[in-house]
Interface confidence: low
């Protein structure tokens, strides 16, 4: 069962999954100027059995220049065009450390993929929060959110985290102390 909504947004924090439950979908998004190959799947799907889980389908992008259609693109602010890849890199580093039954690890990048990954989470998925660079975590409880089914509807639990002040970012489970980066972390991961 797919979760209806995005995980909660926490000011000055970003979230990510350590591993993805079976049934999770990842959109096959391509960067500007590219699109999915004609026969390509629109998404990757985490599937598996009791012993092994993996991503079905492979995302493939091709140049969208030679097409029999005309595309009109509304100009976007420069900062939106050049999205940071910090988040994706840190996700992949973290994914190497985990192997949970019934879960898939972070899929490897594909050529010309978009810099922002869009996930569609399923009931039972946990995502973890950390404060962005320059903010300190005040924990009142777990800095995580779980997608749960309640009375036939899905909902995300509220993470008990406040980000404040000027200090190093808090860590995701199992993640080493990050090296200082002038870019910091993006504010959120676009997921569903």
């Amino acid at each position: 069962e797919l979760c209806d909504d995005d995980p909660p947004k926490i000011t000055h924090a970003t979230f990510k999954a350590v591993a993805y439950k079976e049934g999770t979908m990842l959109n096959c998004e391509c960067k500007r100027g590219f699109r999915r190959i004609k026969s390509g799947s629109p998404y990757m799907l985490c599937t598996g059995n009791s012993s092994h889980s993996s991503w079905d389908n492979q995302c493939q992008c091709t140049s969208s220049a030679a097409r029999n259609t005309t595309k009109q693109v509304t100009p976007q602010p420069e900062e939106q065009k050049e999205r940071k890849t910090t988040e994706m890199q840190s996700q992949m580093q973290l994914a190497d450390q985990v192997s949970l039954p019934g879960h898939c690890r972070e899929p490897p990048p594909w050529e010309n993929e978009a810099t922002e990954r869009i996930y569609h989470f399923v009931v039972g998925q946990t995502v973890y929060y950390q404060c962005v660079q320059g903010y300190r975590a005040l924990h009142r409880g777990p800095a995580e959110s779980v997608c749960k089914m309640t009375h036939g509807k899905t909902r995300w639990t509220q993470p008990q985290l406040i980000c404040t002040g000027e200090t190093e970012p808090s860590q995701f489970p199992g993640e080493e102390e990050p090296q200082a980066s002038p870019d910091g972390l993006p504010e959120s991961e676009t997921s569903r």
């Epitope: 979908m25 959109n27 699109r35 999915r36 998404y43 259609t69 693109v73 509304t74 569903r192």
Partner: nanobody, 127 residues
């Protein structure tokens, strides 16, 4: 899930105009790219136009560019296709379609990548 219902088709003379509407039910409507396709008798279903879920982008097949305009109203769960300067070759059944996954930035002209379809509305352009 998204359910789609087209309306606004009819008989019109060449050079005339029609506005097709597509009513969508389902609270996740605004998350899907929406497209219009058409199918003339004895021919395959072909792409006409598509609009992104966030209304940032539109895309048209070359034969309708400058004559057709796709738009959407996410508050009303509606998609529209304004068709001007209609030609006899525009005669077909017009279908409204929603992408197979939400939040996709890739607006495909390939019918197989659309997961939800309406029943279609007939447009006939006489010369």
């Amino acid at each position: 899930q998204v359910q789609l219902q087209e309306s606004g088709g009819g008989l019109v003379q060449a050079g005339g105009s029609l506005r097709l509407s597509c009513a969508a039910s389902g609270r996740t409507f605004s998350s899907y790219a929406m497209g219009w396709f058409r199918q003339a008798p004895g021919k395959e279903r072909e792409f006409v136009a598509v609009i992104s879920w966030n209304v940032d982008n539109t895309e048209y097949t070359d034969s309708v560019k400058g004559r057709f305009t796709i738009s959407r109203d996410n508050d009303k769960n509606m998609v529209y296709l304004q068709m001007n300067s209609l030609k006899p070759e525009d005669t077909a059944v017009y279908y409204c379609a929603a992408d197979s996954i939400p939040l996709s930035s890739d607006m495909s002209p390939t019918a197989t990548e659309y997961g939800y379809w309406g029943q279609g509305t007939q447009v006939t352009v006489s010369s």
